[in-house]
Interface confidence: low
């Protein structure tokens, strides 16, 4: 049986049930190579409370559809009068990066995961030449996720004192120059995640090979190497390599750009101070507020919720967008789709799409940017579920009683972008964490 998602095969992935202090290792094409789970375990569960391991999915007992992967075991669930077996079930949804498997829940018999990944899309528009896992769990099982830093087109310019060269990098995947053929990047070789531009020439100085690693709680490392043989003539016989160290700052701060800290014989060391290197609970909330000791800030967007069936309306040329954030009030136009953002075609108001659902909500505050994300909307032709990204700005003189109003700024591959100036986005900072 052919592997259903070959792009995901090269790695053993991790997911965590934080409530029960359980770490899962997942290898969807082979086995996880953990002795305690046996030789053919595809999903190995490490219970850190009891310090035990259990195989909860066998690679031999795999069944797959386009969007669901199930691994059975021969282990009985011991439920009275039933013949159920322990199994793992992974639901795949189209995403714009390789993504991460997320633990959803576990019943006594079944361990459920959800995975938004390019591997599950109907079209290849989001697929990279080369991409590696871009998240890691620290020793306290807290997730550090750099997926939001991955550029689907273009690259980051590294801050470097050399006026004759420019070093461009992407995070965890190669630089896509086709989707964004900027003049400097156009010459970058395919597959490169670190491209050195000198004059009109561009050189591959590193490609992603291994996933993100954690070296200390607040320091993550990504290494790129030049895969192909043949040395570059300016490298003194050495093979180029790039090491990017992502550092979680000791207190809340604006974002910085990656800085070159050392360079010798085409070995480049880059340091990037970014809150995306911090653990995810420090940055994100599933509600419309972020507060408490853990986050160092107080943010509450719940006053933006509309009551009485009214919605915010944002004009998007061909479409009108109806938004109802931070609540569970149905948008009247949106036909009981549980939409937080609803897209209605002006020329045909029967064409209605959910552009993100209110129970699929993430509030994120990172590197000084406050963003509310609604995902899980109606599918586009690629298989990607529409989503909306609302970027908030603090404005203490915003109209509409300080609430302000969302402004549609554009759409890229079924992701809809809005900006929203409001006094409720003014962040109150606490002491550092």
């Amino acid at each position: 049986q052919a592997a259903p998602f070959p792009e995901l095969c090269s790695y053993t992935w991790e997911a965590v049930d934080t409530k029960n202090n359980v770490l899962y290792k997942i290898n969807i094409c082979g086995s996880v190579d953990i002795v305690q789970c046996g030789p053919s375990s595809a999903v190995c569960m490490h219970d850190l409370k009891t310090r035990t391991y259990h195989s909860v999915g066998d690679s031999v007992l795999r069944s797959a559809t386009r969007s669901l992967l199930e691994f059975n075991t021969t282990v009985s669930c011991d439920q009275q009068g039933t013949n159920h077996r322990v199994q793992s079930s992974i639901a795949f949804l189209c995403g714009k990066t390789l993504g991460t498997p997320e633990f959803v829940t576990a019943t006594f018999c079944v361990h459920y995961f959800e995975w938004r990944t390019t591997a599950a899309c109907k079209k290849d528009i989001f697929k990279a030449n080369k991409e590696v896992p871009c998240y890691v769990f620290d020793e306290e099982l807290r997730k550090h996720d750099l997926n939001p830093l991955i550029k689907l087109s273009g690259a980051y310019l590294v801050d470097d004192s050399d006026p004759d060269t420019s070093l461009f990098i992407n995070v965890c995947r190669d630089i896509d120059t086709l989707r964004d053929p900027g003049s400097q990047l156009r010459a970058c070789p395919p597959g490169t995640a670190a491209c050195l531009v000198r004059g009109h020439q561009a050189f591959d100085v590193g490609q992603p090979r291994d996933g993100l690693k954690v070296v200390r709680k607040d320091r993550l490392v990504l290494s790129y190497v030049r895969e192909e043989a043949g040395k570059l003539d300016f490298c003194d016989g050495h093979s180029p390599a790039v090491t990017i160290t992502f550092v979680c700052p000791s207190e809340r701060r604006e974002g910085t750009i990656p800085k070159l800290t050392a360079k010798s014989n085409c070995r480049y060391e880059i340091e990037w101070i970014t809150e995306y290197a911090c653990h995810r609970d420090y940055l994100e909330s599933k509600t419309c507020s972020l507060s408490g000791e853990q986050q160092d800030v107080s943010i509450d967007l719940t006053p933006l919720a509309q009551s009485g069936g009214s919605s915010y309306i944002s004009d998007g040329k061909e479409y009108l967008f109806y938004l109802n954030v931070c609540g569970e009030t149905e948008i009247q136009f949106c036909n009981k789709k549980q939409a937080a953002v609803c897209q209605v075609k002006k020329s045909d108001t029967s064409q209605v799409k959910a552009a993100g659902r209110y129970h699929n909500q993430t509030l994120r505050y990172s590197d000084g940017d406050l963003t509310l994300i609604y995902f899980g909307g109606d599918e586009c032709s690629s298989g990607f579920q529409r989503m909306s990204v609302i970027n908030f700005e603090c404005n203490k003189t915003a109209g509409n009683d300080g609430k302000g109003t969302p402004v549609f700024t554009g759409e890229v591959d079924c992701t809809y972008f809005f900006t929203w100036d409001t006094e409720y986005a003014c962040v109150h900072h606490h002491h550092h964490h």
Partner: nanobody, 116 residues
């Protein structure tokens, strides 16, 4: 001292039953995955059954439906109930405790002979 001690082996006729016990000392018994293995004369040691700490059980195809693994946490003991025994079940039976924080611990074995 960490150790496992098996007992309950002996001579039994085909179709008969035996219950093997494996008593553990020096380990947090309930934290460990417990396995039974067996080794017939002149053959490789083979896995028989597993009882994970959650109570999940799994068996080798050759014993499925005939053998049952269970545990008594209060007595720090794991059992292997063997019914409908066959001559090919003749072997030394070993229990093993698996823990991520300790090396695997094996018992010294108990001999089961199935013969008429």
């Amino acid at each position: 001292d960490v150790q496992l001690v098996e007992s309950g082996g002996g001579l039994v006729q085909p179709g008969g039953s035996l219950r093997l016990s494996c008593a553990a000392s020096g380990i947090i018994f309930s934290d460990n995955r417990m396995d039974w293995y067996r080794q017939a004369p002149g053959k490789q040691r083979e896995w028989v059954a597993t009882l994970a700490s959650y109570g999940w059980k799994t068996y080798a195809d050759s014993v499925k439906g005939r053998f049952t693994i269970s545990r008594d946490n209060a007595k720090n003991t794991v059992y292997l109930q063997m019914n409908s025994l066959r001559p090919e079940d003749t072997a030394v039976y070993y229990c093993k405790a698996s823990s991520p924080v300790l090396n695997d611990i094996w018992g010294q074995g108990t001999l089961v002979t199935v013969s008429s």
